[in-house]
């Protein structure tokens, strides 16, 4: 019989404790949020907030720019200075709650912890490939906010998602807040609303649309807004919230929230509960029926998926797919399975799943005993009846009022458990060439880039490295720019090429051969690298 | 200071295309919104539709299968095509730019005239 | 589509105070239609004076404002001056995505 070379196990043909340096910035304070823009000139930015502070990169993260968002009633505070000469508000420092683009503009809108989460526009101006902040503008007019009703009043000290969706020639910011008794009786940001800027950016316009959490309710019933998108003709936010009103607050679930991006309003809200699983191939005994549930959301990204694992989801190509990275409990702490799992929800099911919900509260015959639900947000009703009515009004209509769906949307782990221990804090999702790549970070400041493929048992690696060598956690806000994708860590923005950060980590030819063509990987006498890295022979053929 | 500035034929033939140029200066079109907007002789203005800091367009539906709205972002102008023009057509063409919901800037206006 | 219908032709003295009205056929104007007036000169020269209701535009003098009144868009001049003799436009914005102009006002500062 021939002999043949023994072969290599998979897992010895990788080192992933092989070290890669990418670009970084070290921002002098935690990161507390991050955009970036890219223009149609070449010209591009990047922005992140820190206490106090908001800095103004170009895309090779060098700086470009500083400027002082606080503390407030600080006279060297220079976005607190265009609001005029204060006090505005008690003293405090700035913690950057919302930094979002207005591309129409375009401009960057940031918005803080301090002055009643108010908000301030900064104009870009290019200059050559690079791009600087215009003076602020407070968009905050005294005169036309109070406690109660304050359509200056966005951000929210507890957190606040916003998404800016162009309607016609309109920009709408769709808003999400959590809150508590004190954020709601101090110039209240109300949990979910739709505002418009004004056109002398003076502020946002009055009489905007909102919903917001019962007074009654605000002390049991509190909601994290984790993540916020717009594809198609909806706006989408994440939640992670206590199960039932009346119910033990700790027992948390994640619930997804629809809104209308074609018209600015609220009565086609509408909710539904995510449910995420991991449903081991062999059950243990004693484990529960459908998998052990992961009901608290951790992270999210929305984007179109590669070939294949469109046809494992029995979607098209290219259709927009939410993923999030789901734990057992707030802490994340450890369980009978993997720390983290994610978990797939194409859109398009989630919005047929919706409608199919909105059908069965609203068309004859109703099921009777099916409740509205959101009571959080509305007085209990049963279906069709709007909230708190025993009846529908002869001009009224179902369908124009809020509505949580009876059912919940399941999925399983797409990785089959085999994230193990990782606790992810950071995802982003690719598609390239026909592969969709998981970029996730991690609670121990690493990067790993993963093919996201349900039907294997082992993980396939773009690359899993370390960003750096304080151990941060990675934060959950990941930015694109270009082929880069920017991860925070502690006080520090890296930016990591979504093609991976190159291919010294595969040990083997063979292995090396075999990645990925977007990887750009080939055999280099003794190592595994890109042209770039090869003075000499590169071969991407065949191995030696 | 934005300045607008509209070129073309003062004389189109029925039946054939009507084209415009406006020329933008001190503000780059991949701001904001563009618009194109008619006076008839007897008073009456049209809007025509738009095209977006983005590219994306929007046309009045009496117009929407006859007109053309294109840009060139290099050049900083942006162009109008209407088919198919009849006499109708004859008026006074103006580009205007809106800035947060306000058509603040205008261009001079140029007048088409549509006759054999 | 809707129609937006002004007065005609109204005449006013200077220093006095006039108000140009706009209706719309599709009920009333509410802030969502953006209102803007627009003004026409002699010379057919265009200017942007007031958007999105109440807003002047740049450059635009304080005696020149905008509001609701009642179910239509309103232009108050106050204070006219023999300047402002001109064509006033109203626009409102519809939810499909575009402007409608109103017929026009010619105003006469005698």
């Known amino acids: 019989e021939d002999w043949q070379c023994p072969r290599t196990p998979y897992a010895a043909s990788r080192d992933f404790d092989v070290k890669y340096v990418v670009p970084s910035f070290s921002a002098g304070g935690l990161v507390q949020a991050m955009v970036t823009y890219e223009g149609d000139r070449n010209e591009s930015a990047v922005f992140v907030a820190i206490r106090n502070r908001l800095h103004v990169l170009g895309p090779d993260l060098k700086s470009v720019q500083s400027l002082a968002t606080g503390p407030a009633g600080d006279p060297g505070c220079q976005t607190c200075a265009a609001c005029g000469p204060g006090p505005h508000g008690p003293p405090g420092d700035t913690d950057t709650k919302v930094l979002v683009l207005d591309p129409a503009l375009p401009a960057l809108v940031s918005c803080g912890s301090s002055l009643q989460g108010r908000c301030f526009l900064h104009d870009l101006e290019p200059q050559g490939t690079a791009v600087h902040l215009a003076a602020p503008a407070c968009l905050f007019s005294a005169h036309h906010n109070r406690p109660d009703d304050c359509p200056d009043c966005v951000a929210s000290p507890l957190g606040t998602r916003v998404t800016v969706v162009e309607q016609g020639q309109a920009s709408y910011f769709y808003v999400a807040s959590s809150l508590d008794a004190a954020v709601a009786a101090s110039f209240s940001p109300r949990s979910v609303s739709i505002r418009r800027l004004k056109a002398d950016a003076s502020g946002f316009a009055p009489g905007f649309v909102a919903l917001s959490v019962l007074p009654k309710h605000l002390v049991s019933y509190s909601i994290e807004y984790v993540h916020s998108f717009h594809t198609g003709a909806f706006v989408y936010f994440l939640t992670v919230q206590p199960a039932s009103v009346t119910d033990d607050p700790s027992a948390l679930h994640t619930r997804l929230a629809r809104l209308s991006a074609t018209e600015p309003e609220l009565g086609d809200y509408r909710e539904l509960v995510l449910d995420c699983r991991f449903a081991p191939k062999r059950r243990r005994r004693g484990a529960p029926e459908g998998g052990q549930p992961y009901p608290v959301l951790r992270v999210a990204h929305s984007a179109p998926v590669g070939a294949q694992l469109a046809t494992e989801l029995s979607i098209a190509e290219g259709q927009e797919v939410l993923f999030g990275v789901f734990v057992t409990g707030k802490d994340g702490g450890p369980g009978v399975g993997p720390n983290s799992v994610v978990c797939a929800f194409p859109i398009d099911l989630l919005d047929t799943l919706i409608d199919e919900g909105v059908e069965r509260c609203c068309e004859s015959p109703v099921h009777p005993g099916l409740r509205r639900g959101l009571d959080f947000f509305q007085s209990p009703s049963f279906c069709p009846n709007p909230p708190g009515l025993e009846a529908l009004s002869p001009n009224t209509s179902c369908r124009h009022f809020p509505l949580l769906v009876s059912s919940s949307f399941s999925r399983v782990d797409l990785f089959n458990g085999l994230l193990g221990p990782v606790q992810v804090t950071a995802l982003y999702v690719t598609r390239l060439d026909n592969v969709t790549v998981a970029h996730m970070g991690t609670m121990d400041g690493r990067i790993l880039q993963v093919e996201l493929v349900r039907s294997l048992n082992y993980l396939l690696y773009v690359s899993n490295f370390s960003l750096g060598d304080s151990g941060q956690p990675v934060q959950r806000d990941v930015s694109r720019l270009g082929d880069h994708l920017l991860f925070a860590s502690g006080d520090q923005v890296f930016q990591v090429p979504i093609q991976g950060p190159g291919c010294r980590h595969f040990l083997t030819c063979g292995r090396c051969l075999r990645a990925w063509h977007f990887m750009g990987c080939g055999w280099c006498g003794n190592m595994c690298g890109q042209q770039k890295e090869c003075p000499g022979s590169w071969q991407q053929d065949h191995c030696p | 200071e934005v300045q607008l500035q509209e070129s073309g034929p003062s004389l189109v033939k029925p039946s054939q295309t009507l084209s415009l140029t406006c020329y933008v200066t001190g503000d780059s079109i991949t701001s904001d919104y563009w618009n194109w907007i008619r006076k008839f002789p007897g008073n009456k203005l049209e809007y025509m539709g738009y095209?977006?800091?983005?590219?994306?367009?929007y046309y009045n539906p009496s117009l929407k299968s006859r007109i053309s709205i294109t840009r060139d972002t290099s050049k900083n102008q942006f162009y109008l095509r209407l088919n198919s023009v009849t006499t109708e057509d004859t008026a006074t063409y103006y580009c205007?730019?809106?800035?947060?919901?306000?058509?603040?800037?205008w261009g001079q206006g140029t007048l088409v005239t549509v006759s054999a | 589509q809707a129609v937006v219908t002004q007065e005609s032709a109204l005449t006013t003295s200077p220093g006095e105070t006039v108000t140009l009205t706009c209706r719309s056929s599709?009920?009333?104007?509410?802030?969502?239609?953006?209102a803007n007036w627009v003004q026409e000169k002699p010379d057919h020269l265009f200017t942007g004076l007031i958007g999105d209701t109440n807003i002047r535009a740049p450059g635009v003098p304080a005696r020149f404002s905008g509001s609701l009144i009642g179910d239509k868009a309103a232009l108050t001049i106050t204070g006219a001056q023999t300047e402002d003799e001109a064509i006033y436009f109203c626009?409102?914005?519809?939810?499909?995505?575009?402007?409608?102009f109103g017929g026009g006002t010619k105003l006469t500062v005698l």
């Open positions: 599709a009920g009333a104007v509410t802030t969502s239609n953006f």
């Open positions: 626009a409102l914005w519809y939810s499909n995505h575009y402007w409608v």
């Open positions: 095209i977006s800091y983005s590219g994306s367009t």
């Open positions: 205007a730019r809106t800035h947060i919901l306000t058509i603040a800037y």
